[in-house]
């Protein structure tokens, strides 16, 4: 077990934050919740501080939760390869270029790390060439989010990894919105960190709304676990 | 879903004592930091107190040897006892979880906060 690994063995607070500024819309979120690392789940509920969020809830998932792959669910044969946890307590960057096909792009940085016994997650958002009547700007994307794979391979120069994936989002007139992830993870600290064979992160989140909340929001049940990575033949063999 | 149900509310006269209940659900109740913070007719809203995991307590000077906060992790639920209760105490009373313990912080950006329960002191 990683050092860092042990911080997870129960339930983690989890605290969110988000500044943003897509085409000059600026806002600001907050999200706080819970994580599980031994069910690979999470719970979270997210709230825009500013007002009316100006871009759809599901185009902000990966960077909330996805930002926090340190509460994947690895199983015990693939431990050796949880980049994550064993960057913690310390922590790591986490930068992205995601890519709206035919629309505009965002790139984020945050940085995921313990403060006190809190997995905190700092972003900054940034997003540029939007169209104002696109699916994003103009709101058209369904309130609910699909199954994806996120593949994970080292990044030795860099002592982190990184990742690439593409999102679909569903578009309210039946059709689909991709978004390319292109993901980089370094390590804020100088410690020893587990760096992986490639595998993949399999992902399921099911969003829905508090009906008591007046706010603008979004409520997210995530769970994730890690998978590609085959038991080697002495565990055959055991 | 999370959810914060607080009672315990109601018309006291002044000097006189209430006690606030507020019942946590959907949420690992032991792990958050809880708060309550009270909203009066055309005033700011105003924390009130804080209690975190470990027990430890924070209060507002307004309210410091009047009021005690408590929680009971086996029960998910936090109280707030209001002793000597002052015509200025009247307000709406609510409860919150966060999993951040700042003090002070902005009462409006709690997440989880539950609907309030109307407190009414006269003199």
């Known amino acids: 077990m990683s050092k860092g690994e042990e911080l997870f063995t129960g339930v983690v607070p989890i605290l969110v934050e988000l500044d943003g500024d897509v085409n000059g819309h600026k806002f600001s979120v907050s999200g706080e919740g819970e994580g599980d690392a031994t069910y690979g789940k999470l719970t979270l509920k997210f709230i825009c501080t500013t007002g009316k969020l100006p871009v759809p809830w599901p185009t902000l998932v990966t960077t909330f939760s996805y930002g926090v792959q340190c509460f994947s669910r690895y199983p015990d044969h693939m431990k050796q390869h949880d980049f994550f946890k064993s960057a913690m307590p310390e922590g790591y960057v986490q930068e992205r270029t995601i890519s709206f096909k035919d629309d505009g792009n965002y790139k984020t940085r945050a940085e995921v790390k313990f403060e006190g016994d809190t997995l905190v997650n700092r972003i900054e958002l940034k997003g540029i060439d939007f169209k104002e009547d696109g699916n994003i700007l103009g709101h058209k994307l369904e309130y609910n989010y699909n199954s994806h794979n996120v593949y994970i391979t080292a990044d030795k120069q860099k002592n982190g990894i990184k990742a690439n994936f593409k999102i679909r989002h569903n578009i309210e007139d039946g059709s689909v919105q991709l978004a390319d992830h292109y993901q980089q993870n370094t390590p804020i600290g100088d410690g020893p960190v587990l760096l992986p064979d490639n595998h993949y992160l399999s992902t399921q989140s099911a969003l829905s709304k508090d009906p008591n909340e007046k706010r603008d929001h979004m409520v997210l049940l995530e769970f994730v676990t890690a998978a590609g990575i085959t038991h080697g033949m002495d565990e055959l063999y055991k | 879903q999370v959810q914060l149900q607080e009672s315990g509310g109601g018309s006291v006269q002044a000097g006189g004592s209430l006690r606030l209940s507020c019942v946590a659900s959907?949420?690992?109740?032991?792990?958050?930091?809880m708060y309550w913070y009270r909203q009066a007719p055309g005033k700011a809203c105003e924390l009130v107190s804080l209690?975190?995991?470990?027990?430890?307590?924070t209060y507002a000077d307004s309210v410091k040897g009047r009021f005690t906060i408590s929680r009971d992790d086996a029960k998910n639920t936090v109280y707030l006892q209001m002793n000597s209760l002052e015509p200025e105490d009247t307000a709406v009373y609510y409860c919150?979880?966060?999993?951040?313990?700042?003090?002070?912080?902005?009462?409006?950006?709690?997440?989880?906060q539950g609907q309030g329960t109307q407190v009414t002191v006269s003199s």
């Open positions: 919150a979880a966060s999993t951040a313990g700042n003090w002070p912080r902005a009462c409006t950006d709690f997440v989880y």
């Open positions: 959907g949420l690992t109740f032991s792990i958050y930091r």
């Open positions: 209690i975190i995991p470990d027990g430890t307590t």
